[in-house]
Amino acid sequence: LEASEEVELEPCLAPSLEQQEQELTVALGQPVRLCCGRAERGGHWYKEGSRLAPAGRVRGWRGRLEIASFLPEDAGRYLCLARGSMIVLQNLTLITGDSLTSSNDDEDPKSHRDPSNRHSYPQQAPYWTHPQRMEKKLHAVPAGNTVKFRCPAAGNPTPTIRWLKDGQAFHGENRIGGIRLRHQHWSLVMESVVPSDRGTYTCLVENAVGSIRYNYLLDVLERSPHRPILQAGLPANTTAVVGSDVELLCKVYSDAQPHIQWLKHIVINGSSFGADGFPYVQVLKTADINSSEVEVLYLRNVSAEDAGEYTCLAGNSIGLSYQSAWLTVLPEEDPTWTAAAPEARYTD
């Protein structure tokens, strides 16, 4: 990734589960802002193993890595660690714009793949071209993640690469989903890893002059049961005109079988809450996740009475999660008028 203005990896939302390394090229003097985790519970940023302070020219603060003006000494490996754990949320290398290293992680400028170079002398045994990409040997990733191991190498003649798992030739034929062997990128990619993928993975790089090898140790962590996770921002606050149709969406993620209800908050005797402190609600829809379109609440031909707060409630054997949104209904005759709706409420 090369940018002429500010480098911004992604907004501060929930991180991707994929922990693949990234390499970003940053021009000298350029500001950098990288995000990791939600702002209020953002991960901790580390540079070359040392945690970044929340103040200073280069700082790690509320999940953000901020560099006011990129200098040569800012280049290096940055990791973002989930608070209170060793789970890697971001793993990236910042390099200066004039660096010879490719900004694309899947390209290898030193791999000497020019055929005219293949038989030129002197011959050279294989060597690692990017050992900094191979610093981490012990890996532990959650089941379902994608794992990518790389062993970028060069030599003369151009070496070949093959992969072993637990000392045996590995082609992925017995693995559901198979594997991707990208020889030009010196990489092995396994998608949706499962516990049976645990093991020692060896890249063996050879040419006529010699061979080198490197071991990666992979552990796959089985997902621990949790209550349903609801996608942030859904359902969303919505404004509609009387007589129109409305769809409220709720995306539910759950390993255990979830049960979903759509609720509308109502007022009884002038009160929104009962004596027990719980809100008065009307159950509009209830079903299991495998029911068709249970994650969508359809409201046809809405009227002013349909305005109000709607909640998507999801539960499984572990617990409950819910998120709410407001529907504002405008009169037909004045579609340009908009009412400010309260913000959607989210729960962890």
Partner: antibody, heavy 120, light 111 residues
Framework: EVQLLESGGGLVQPGGSLRLSCAAS????????MGWVRQAPGKGLEWVSV????????IYADSVKGRFTISRDNSKNTLYLQMNSLRAEDTAVYYC?????????????WGQGTMVTVSS | QYELTQPPSASGTPGQRVTISCSGS????????VHWYQQLPGTAPKLLIY???QRPSGVPDRFSVSKSGSSASLAISGLQSEDEADYYC????????????FGTGTKVTVL
């Protein structure tokens, strides 16, 4: 405070068995690779074994393979080393250690050690 | 058995610079990060420095490392009496199977 505390050492006859424990506290035990390192009296450090966070992957030094078994109970934050068919050359202080990704897979936290003596 | 070779001893007077070498092979130091441990008399080892001069908190920058090919070295500048200890280099090794290997250890004496 991040801490590792070994126990279970003692005197055992050749051919006997012993089980070492290592209680971890102050960090999320289930996220870390853990290992055992030993040191014979007056000698240097020797790596013994390592186990992955889930316990599903274990690796041993050739000198103990087939005789020692490393395991863990993440619900109890405890690491174990089951030592069978003990020999005189297994006499050493046994250290439990945490391997950290931030320290590029080095052992960044060590216990105080427990002494194992194999003698008739 | 030890795959990494260190000199058995090194010494210096306070304020001097002492260097400890660590020699390995392409399957360990040549391909992997080198870790250095300090063991003060009668105590457990502690991680001193690793990788490209990365130190756990509390380790002074008097300790520095370098690596070239299959060899590495640890330098202690401005030697102090509290530096008297055993020092071990270590690395993962990729010959045939993965394992971790320590150096033979170097006893540093402050004269």
């Amino acid at each position: 405070e991040v801490q590792l505390l070994e126990s279970g050492g003692g005197l055992v006859q050749p051919g006997g068995s012993l089980r070492l424990s290592c209680a971890a506290s102050g960090f999320t035990f289930s996220h870390y690779w853990m290992g055992w390192v030993r040191q014979a009296p007056g000698k240097g450090l020797e790596w013994v074994s390592v186990i992955s966070p889930s316990g599903g992957l274990t690796i041993y030094a050739d000198s103990v393979k087939g005789r020692f078994t490393i395991s863990r109970d993440n619900s109890k934050n405890t690491l174990y080393l089951q030592m069978n068919s003990l020999r005189a050359e297994d006499t050493a202080v046994y250290y439990c250690a945490r391997s950290s990704g931030w320290a590029l897979d080095a052992f960044d936290i060590w216990g105080q050690g427990t002494m194992v003596t194999v003698s008739s | 058995q030890y795959e990494l070779t260190q000199p058995p001893s090194a010494s210096g007077t306070p304020g001097q610079r002492v260097t400890i070498s660590c020699s390995g092979s392409s399957s360990n130091i040549g391909s992997n990060i080198v870790h250095w441990y300090q063991q003060l008399p009668g105590t457990a080892p502690k991680l001193l420095i690793y990788g490209n001069n990365q130190r756990p908190s509390g380790v002074p920058d008097r300790f520095s490392v370098s690596k070239s090919g299959s060899s590495a070295s640890l330098a202690i500048s401005g030697l102090q009496s509290e530096d008297e200890a055993d020092y071990y280099c270590a690395s993962w090794d990729d010959s045939l199977k993965a394992f971790y290997v320590f150096g033979t250890g170097t006893k540093v004496t402050v004269l």
